[in-house]
Interface confidence: medium
Amino acid sequence: SPVPFGPEGRLEDKLHKPKATQTEVKPSVRFNLRTSKDPEHEGCYLSVGHSQPLEDCSFNMTAKTFFIIHGWTMSGIFENWLHKLVSALHTREKDANVVVVDWLPLAHQLYTDAVNNTRVVGHSIARMLDWLQEKDDFSLGNVHLIGYSLGAHVAGYAGNFVKGTVGRITGLDPAGPMFEGADIHKRLSPDDADFVDVLHTYTRSFGLSIGIQMPVGHIDIYPNGGDFQPGCGLNDVLGSIAYGTITEVVKCEHERAVHLFVDSLVNQDKPSFAFQCTDSNRFKKGICLSCRKNRCNSIGYNAKKMRNKRNSKMYLKTRAGMPFRVYHYQMKIHVFSYKNMGEIEPTFYVTLYGTNADSQTLPLEIVERIEQNATNTFLVYTEEDLGDLLKIQLTWEGASQSWYNLWKEFRSYLSQPRNPGRELNIRRIRVKSGETQRKLTFCTEDPENTSISPGRELWFRKCRDGWRMKNETSPTVELP
């Protein structure tokens, strides 16, 4: 393979040179100041020591400056996510400088070689920032590095090498291979900027994890657990792309981090909130919907600066496309008795009725098992803003929809052939909205009828003593 960079940081690729053609050597890292939202505008190339382009292209020394850093590339060209991100930044921050860091020659190589080139690219960015700092009014605190995949670690190196501290680094699904478990100086880490926020969308605990699993920022956000992204299944991809392949699924999930960030820029009125939690399973149980003590935050561009003593892992659910925002609810269901449960876990569904809209029928995911004489917590989420909740319909699915459950039911029947009907008793459901932090209690419509069995439903209305917690704060509004 070619020598990736020479002494001046220039690409010296002597392969595939057409005969009798000009072979001007170009810098391997170029800084393209985007002067328009249109990708057709060529922008202006900035280079250290050359002040004229800064003047010609109206570089605003007092404004925010974004550096967008791409990652490894198989095609050797810029992908469309870059255009969408540039456009969104220009829309949101009209006076800002948006600089695309073009390191395509060093990224369009074997992945391992591209990884080895991240350090030199980080150095180039740091040199550019050091030079800009020599200018009056330019502040490193106004600099926001946004790196996707391998570009996130490039941003980390840049933040590490620069003289001073950059204001913010956003890591968009930082690359996993060769970085997972690496020393903090060899990957993106919290000490690379004043605020480091990270979105993880393609992490896998089995097989190859394209995105890094470990937390690497001040806040690390794992949408949908950080692994399977809605709308990115093979079926979804096959439906939307002429030649859908597993590669498209990987691209869809890995690139989702970028689109979530773009969404936070363009759909400012529909912010998505993430909630601090120790792990994905606890979040799925609905345990982690608190906003107390900075336990929740907006995701993407609108994230509030949090410099925690240790990494803060945060979770949320999203829709399959823009706007990605969903509305999270914690449901606490106290099961005070049950009859003849057998081996099989019940399959519950809820429908929420609100002042603005009614939800679809939502499954209650049983992460472990239903506990008797205990409060069972569930997470449900809706794509619509339901407004204030009025009533809840709880349904116990009758006929099993999985072969596994059918088999378990059959075994239960064999062991207890005269098994009378299974039954659960539920008096109330406590609901907490993640987005408003409001808590409400719902009681059965008929206080005498609290039992539910397969194929039946139970209705709950706001209890007379419906309550909301006064000391909780909402991510959107401060509650009294």
Partner: antibody, heavy 119, light 106 residues
Framework: QVQLVQSGAEVKKPGASVKVSCKAS????????MHWVRQAPGQGLEWMGS????????SYNEKFKDRVTSTRDTSISTAYMELSRLRSDDTVVYYC????????????WGQGTTVTVSS | EIVLTQSPATLSLSPGERATLSCRAS?????MYWYQQKPGQAPRLLIY???NLAPGIPARFSGSGSGTDFTLTISSLEPEDFAVYYC?????????FGGGTKVEIK
């Protein structure tokens, strides 16, 4: 190899509309903006507008803005340019041209579609 | 809009001679692009970002200039170089082309 194949020649009456297609092959259609450029006989080149096939965003020359519409069908990797309220001076050759976002030039062109406007 | 004026309109030269084509912009542009067009064919990119040679273009073609004045030079004309040449800018929409310079055999 990269190819842009345009639809055949058209003869239209003044006031009518024409829709020219440009079928792309040999590359990922959604990764490049498609532009439309026209050329009158023996004259220079004139940029009309563009479409980003990835999400359908369009950009037009003000001169044609109220008459031109760019669309695309990603399932068949085809871009379309429709020009309405045709006049005799629209008798020109229409080209589609591929533009690499941030690469900065028209690297591949269609073969051209001749549109004749005559009563 | 930015108007690009090419001169001369026609250049009559012999094979082996040097051709110098000029393109002047009505206001400053960041970069200039040059295309070659032969009768009945679509334009073909020669130069991008003012001085960069497009893939497969012979080294006898070169571009230079800045601001409002740009030049395309063909160091030694080959028979296949006789064609019309257009300059173009991407600095400001609408993206405009020059009127063209026809290089013909003397």
């Amino acid at each position: 190899q990269v190819q842009l194949v345009q639809s055949g020649a058209e003869v239209k009456k003044p006031g009518a509309s024409v829709k020219v297609s440009c079928k792309a092959s040999g590359y990922t259609f959604t990764e490049y903006t498609m532009h439309w450029v026209r050329q009158a006989p023996g004259q220079g080149l004139e940029w009309m507008g563009s479409i980003n096939p990835y999400y359908g965003g369009t950009s037009y020359n003000e001169k044609f803005k109220d008459r031109v519409t760019s669309t695309r069908d990603t399932s068949i990797s085809t871009a379309y340019m429709e020009l309405s309220r045709l006049r005799s001076d629209d008798t020109v050759v229409y080209y589609c041209a591929r533009y690499g976002n941030y690469v900065g030039y028209f690297d591949y062109w269609g073969q051209g579609t001749t549109v004749t406007v005559s009563s | 809009e930015i108007v690009l004026t090419q001169s001369p309109a026609t250049l009559s030269l012999s094979p082996g001679e040097r051709a110098t084509l000029s393109c002047r912009a009505s206001s400053s542009v960041h970069y200039m692009y040059w295309y070659q067009q032969k009768p009945g064919q679509a334009p073909r990119l020669l130069i991008y970002y003012t001085s960069n040679l497009a893939p497969g273009i012979p080294a006898r073609f070169s571009g230079s200039g800045s601001g409002t004045d740009f030049t395309l030079t063909i160091s030694s004309l080959e028979p296949e170089d006789f064609a019309v040449y257009y300059c173009q800018q991407f600095t400001s929409s609408p993206y405009t082309f020059g009127g063209g310079t026809k290089v013909e055999i003397k």
